[in-house]
């Protein structure tokens, strides 16, 4: 029997060890500079890493600019957006601005985007000083299903800031659903 | 096999509990203010609690004004820091202000520092106003190997909030590295 | 002993499941905004939703204003508090604003109420503009004791977004205490 | 990488006037507090003046109250040092520096508490 429930307990070992990786998909996305679409309207940003620097994924996939749910669960999302402007790199088109970063989800079965999260800030990015930066942070709880998907969309993309440790967003699944 | 199987069930529910534990480090570090550098440039803030108020920490270690991973895994990492200035303090020597914070991560092995984390915003803070206050939040998952350590940076340190409801940083690990 | 090996492995396969998610409050609650105070003072807010749209709890309790603490553990609070004025809603009292958050932790037992987290910034909204939007976030890792309870405080509640990606608050459990 | 330039220095007669421009490039906050120093042959380092970030406030060493003026422009860079009523022993290498601390302090007018030194102009005022 001593036998027996070594073999239990190895087995079991091995079960809770494998079920707990497999059960907490997540993903840490970061920004991809060479593809941010101009203009200052709110538009879906597409293009980020997810697989050098501080990017991975696991357990999720990124398709088509989104980051796609495989495994129901509860999600903690997050999103970190800095933009920032130098006067080296011309005259704003208008010094009032409205910085926004939007994290949505959307559902393919029944086709429809909702907003999850929002933040950000009006700001006056005057001409009296040449050096212009702020950044956002959002995070919350969330019940996803598999399929889901979770975007990003932001307000005026040509200012974000390229840096990996900048403009990012993820998710990790803390629990099942029950 | 009755007697047996309780047996089992017994030690895995030790065993379990104790694994779970054991796998889930955690901080929660609050500026002590009594030791914050004065200047306008980034300075590294080597000076946090860590067993007092909110402050804690388990299967981490705080040395040398850094947070020292212990156990690899996945870590959600974050921080808090609050700036604010009263005209009881003193004179400003610039009212343009750019007021950050950097989470980085310095691996021993490599003698190397990154950032993981940035955020903040320049600021413009008038004499028209006797009060002014900014707070900034970042956050982010991160896969960390025993032995990195976590170091917060920040602009303008004389501006912090001391409180430990206001600056703040803090990590708890999510799951292990596969 | 095969039989009992089976048996014993799926009994342990539903305590895992079951204690897993027994162990594993949250809480996500979204702003009611049907009864928002009026002024620029501080104030408590109470009103929220648990159980429409994106607002949910479990293994918690929401009762007169605050979230209820039903299960020790340390957990991962946040909170997003997003305010805005547009001109069509008449003249601030103050172009000088304080737009902060308070999260606080309150215990029945020793009735005190202490501040967790705080952020916020001073912000001059000025007549130049038409429209104003700022927003906060804060998050960071507590011990919470069963019956302890979490509420939110902010100045100028009338400035409040009332929609619910924008104002909310939660929690969830990342691990038991020792 | 931070560079502070100065330029504008030159020969010019005793009670003559020049203007000094200190440029900042590399770092993305010129707005800062700036400081002029300036060192004659074999002595050391003299404070001139010392202007805020945005301009409103200024203070000048005792030797060249009432003669030199610290100005900026409004779109932040260059900083300026108005030199007038020029005396020989005003002949010196002038330097601008960015002043290191957040608040403005007793210290201001100490060298050690500015960063990013340029080369200098150097200034002779003879006749």
């Known amino acids: 029997i001593r036998a027996e429930k070594a073999m239990v307990d190895g087995s079991w070992l091995d079960l809770a060890k494998r079920s707990k990786l497999e059960a907490q998909p997540f993903a840490h996305l970061t920004i991809n500079a060479t593809d941010i679409p101009s203009g200052s309207h709110k538009v879906s940003l597409s293009s980020w890493y997810h697989d050098r620097g501080w990017a991975k994924i696991s357990n999720m996939t990124f398709s088509n600019g989104k980051l796609i749910v495989n495994q129901d669960g509860f999600y903690y999302l997050y999103a970190n957006i800095c933009f920032r402007h130098h006067e080296t790199s011309g005259d704003l088109a208008t010094e009032y601005l409205q910085l926004m970063v939007y994290v949505t989800k959307t559902s393919i079965k029944i086709p429809s985007s909702h907003t999850l999260m929002k933040g950000g800030s009006t700001k006056y990015w005057s001409g009296n000083s040449e050096f212009h930066f702020y950044s956002i942070n959002v995070g919350g709880f969330f019940k996803l299903r598999s399929g889901e998907e979770i975007s990003i969309e932001v307000s005026n993309p040509s200012l974000l800031d390229p840096d990996q440790d900048a403009t990012y967003f993820g998710a990790f699944k803390v629990r099942d659903i029950d | 096999i009755r007697a047996e199987k309780a047996m089992v069930d017994g030690s895995w529910l030790d065993l379990a509990k104790r694994s779970k534990l054991e796998a889930q480090p955690f901080a929660h570090l609050t500026i002590n203010a009594t030791d914050i550098p004065s200047g306008s440039h980034k300075v590294s803030l080597s000076s946090w609690y860590h067993d007092r108020g909110w402050a804690k920490i388990s299967n981490m270690t705080f040395s040398n004004g850094k947070l020292i991973v212990n156990q690899d895994g996945f870590y959600y990492l974050y921080a808090n820091i609050c700036f604010r200035h009263h005209e009881t303090s003193g004179d400003l020597a610039t009212e343009y202000l750019q007021l950050m914070v950097y989470v980085t991560k310095t691996s021993i092995k490599i003698p190397s520092s990154h950032t993981l984390m940035k955020g903040g915003s320049t600021k413009y803070w008038s004499g028209n106003s006797e009060f002014h206050f900014y707070s900034i939040n970042v956050g982010g998952f991160f896969k960390l190997r025993s032995g990195e350590e976590i170091s917060i940076e920040v602009s303008n340190p004389s501006l912090l909030d001391p409180d430990q409801d206001a600056t703040y940083f803090g990590a708890f690990k999510v799951r292990d590295i596969d | 002993i095969r039989a009992e090996k089976a048996m014993v492995d799926g009994s342990w396969l539903d305590l895992a499941k079951r204690s897993k998610l027994e162990a594993q409050p949250f809480a996500h609650l979204t702003i009611n905004a049907t009864d928002i105070p009026s002024g620029s003072h501080k104030v408590s807010l109470s009103s929220w939703y648990h159980d429409r749209g994106w607002a949910k709890i479990s293994n918690m309790t929401f009762s007169n204003g605050k979230l209820i603490v039903n299960q020790d553990g340390f957990y991962y609070l946040y909170a997003n508090i997003c305010f805005r004025h547009h001109e069509t809603s008449g003249d601030l009292a103050t172009e000088y604003l304080q737009l902060m958050v308070y999260v606080t932790k309150t215990s029945i037992k020793i009735p005190s109420s202490h501040t967790l987290m705080k952020g916020g910034s001073t912000k001059y909204w000025s007549g130049n503009s038409e429209f104003h939007f700022y927003s906060i976030n804060v998050g960071g890792f507590f011990k919470l004791r069963s019956g302890e309870e979490i509420s939110i405080e902010v100045s100028n509640p009338s400035l409040l977004d009332p929609d619910q990606d924008a104002t909310y608050f939660g929690a969830f459990k990342v691990r038991d205490i020792d | 990488e931070v560079q502070l330039v100065e330029s504008g220095g030159g020969l010019v007669q005793p009670g003559g006037s020049l203007r000094l421009s200190c440029a900042a490039s590399?770092?993305?906050?010129?707005?800062?507090?700036m400081g002029w120093f300036r060192q004659a042959p074999g002595k050391g380092r003299e404070f001139v003046g010392f202007?805020?970030?945005?301009?409103?406030?200024?203070y000048y060493g005792e030797s060249v109250k009432g003669r030199f003026t610290i100005s900026r422009d409004n779109a932040q860079n260059p900083v300026y040092l108005q030199m007038n009523s020029l005396r020989p022993e005003d002949t010196a290498v002038y330097y601008c520096?960015?002043?290191?601390?957040?608040?403005?302090?007793?210290?201001?007018?100490?060298?050690?508490?500015?960063?990013?030194w340029g080369q200098g102009t150097l200034v002779t005022v003879s006749s």
């Open positions: 590399g770092f993305t906050f010129s707005r800062s507090a």
């Open positions: 202007i805020t970030g945005s301009g409103g406030t200024t």
């Open positions: 520096g960015v002043y290191r601390r957040t608040y403005i302090s007793s210290t201001y007018s100490e060298s050690s508490e500015y960063d990013y």
